[in-house]
């Protein structure tokens, strides 16, 4: 007897973070075999989609034309074979920003940090949120994400990053959100540019990237530089 | 920073396969897209496909029949396979990486692009 | 499949001219739109994406703008290096189409 059919892929494009109103597709890929796909969304009633595999069968494409709340949250797909149906796909987080106010970001105790010192970058919401994440330009995923402990509401987050070095530099914005949906994001906050010079005790100028990139794949965060936060948030990886 | 270095024959007879590689270096090819594109003698640009890290992969529908881009994360390559080439299929290939995510809820273009490698079929 | 048409296929403007070269989608596309410029026998170069935001290094005096399916590339002050060919291309969604090219000449 053959063994289960193999779980197809889901991705997204042109990926997986949206701005409200913006159009996202997502798409499924299984095999060859395949005679229908089906969309599921956590929370949601089964399946939440179907389509008819596009030629040559082997994906299906699930269009959302214009992004908002409702679309924003896990997803996996599944694809009918003759034989029956293929195990689920890994998931597909799907989140939507714009959801609240922009928060605002800063540096301290400047954004002109020297290679070898500490700054902090500081995240503030104009209302008590709970989860705060920092973005680096050009990064694929979050850099780093802050969730309070307890639930606790709070107006700010701080990232601290010590010892700085060059590849810190670069441009920054921080998102804020509620823990009862972390796939709703606020506006992004107005960019921060992190600029690092050269150690005192080395005059030579720091190598700057002009792009930086991410290490790991688009659907897993990066992981943190720096130490643990002086605020009551703590970091958490999703 | 990343770069794109390409890689394959530039003379292909007709009814054979064309065979292109792109290495990524100063950076992990595990995020963002990896496509391909080409460029026949005096024409515009046209997409042919790309591939994520995990080998998902979308291609130009005319094109989708003789078409196969595949990744190898090891190595830090992708990979276009053009088969049953034509004189139609003369052109300079070009490999590229679309921008991943931009904090701004935007995503990039293609902002890193291979040199193009100049590809003749012709027996 | 979307299909893009880029507007005018060539156009002659002289140095310091403000010129305006425009890209429409047969269907929405949000601003998931890149324009790129390629010089002769060079490489292609990403000018502009997300429809408005210019990519690092590149002149201000390119911009863009749009969304939906209308969307609109503009050299302020024509400088001789903009002697090139530009191209509007879709990244929404597979396929990532381009525009057919619009040459620019130096009168």
């Known amino acids: 007897q053959a063994g289960p059919l193999p779980k197809p892929t889901l991705w997204a494009e042109p990926g997986s973070v949206i701005s409200w109103g913006n159009s996202v597709t997502i798409w499924c890929q299984g095999t060859l075999e395949a005679r229908e796909y089906r969309l599921d969304k956590e929370e949601s009633p089964a399946p939440w989609d179907r389509q008819n595999p596009l030629e040559p069968k082997n994906k299906a494409r699930f269009s959302i034309p214009s992004m908002t709340e409702d679309y924003a949250g896990r997803y996996r797909c599944y694809y009918r074979s003759p034989v029956g149906w293929s195990q689920p796909s890994d998931p597909l987080e799907l989140v939507m920003t714009g959801a609240y106010s922009k928060p605002t970001l800063s540096a301290l105790p400047s954004p002109l940090v020297t290679s070898g010192k500490s700054v902090t970058l500081l995240c503030q919401s104009r209302s008590p949120m709970d989860t705060f994440l920092l973005i680096k330009e050009r990064a694929a995923h979050p850099l780093l994400h802050l969730r309070s402990e307890h639930g606790a509401q709070q107006h700010q987050a701080e990232f601290p990053m010590s010892p700085v070095t060059s590849v810190h530099g670069g441009t920054y914005r921080c998102f804020s959100s509620h823990g009862f949906s972390h796939y709703l994001l606020s506006h992004p906050s107005d960019p921060l540019e992190l600029i690092v010079s050269g150690s005192l005790e080395d005059p030579r100028p720091s190598p700057t990237r002009s792009v930086s990139t991410a290490a790991g794949p688009e659907d897993q965060p990066l992981m943190p530089t720096g130490s643990v936060p002086h605020s009551g948030l703590r970091r958490h990886w999703e | 920073q990343v770069e794109l270095q390409q890689s394959g024959p530039g003379l292909v007879k007709p009814s054979e396969t064309l065979s292109l590689t792109c290495t990524v270096s100063?950076?992990?090819?595990?995020?963002?897209?990896w496509s391909w594109t080409r460029q026949p003698p005096g024409k515009g640009l046209e997409w042919i496909g790309y591939?994520?890290?995990?080998?998902?992969?979308n291609y130009n529908p005319s094109l989708e029949s003789r078409v196969t881009i595949s990744v190898d994360t090891s190595k830090n390559q992708f990979s276009l396979k053009l088969s049953s080439v034509t004189a139609a299929d003369t052109a300079v290939y070009y490999c590229?990486?679309?921008?991943?995510?931009?904090?701004?809820?935007?995503?990039?273009?293609?902002?890193?692009w291979g040199q193009g490698t100049t590809v003749t079929v012709s027996s | 499949d979307i299909q893009m048409t880029q507007s005018p296929s060539s156009l002659s403007a002289s140095v310091g001219d403000r010129v305006t070269i425009t890209c429409r989608a047969s269907q929405g596309i949000s601003n998931y739109l890149a324009w790129y410029q390629q010089k002769p026998g060079k490489v292609p170069k990403l000018l502009i994406y997300?429809?408005?935001t210019l990519q690092s290094g590149v002149p201000s005096r390119f911009s863009g703008s749009g969304s939906g399916t209308d969307f609109t590339l503009t050299i302020s002050s024509l400088q001789p290096e903009d002697l090139a060919t530009y191209y509007c291309q879709k990244y929404d969604s597979a396929p990532w189409t381009f525009g057919q090219g619009t040459k620019l000449e130096i009168k």
């Open positions: 997300a429809a408005s």
């Open positions: 100063g950076g992990s090819i595990s995020t963002y897209f």
């Open positions: 590229a990486r679309r921008g991943g995510y931009y904090g701004s809820g935007n995503y990039g273009g293609m902002d890193v």
């Open positions: 591939t994520n890290y995990r080998g998902n992969t």
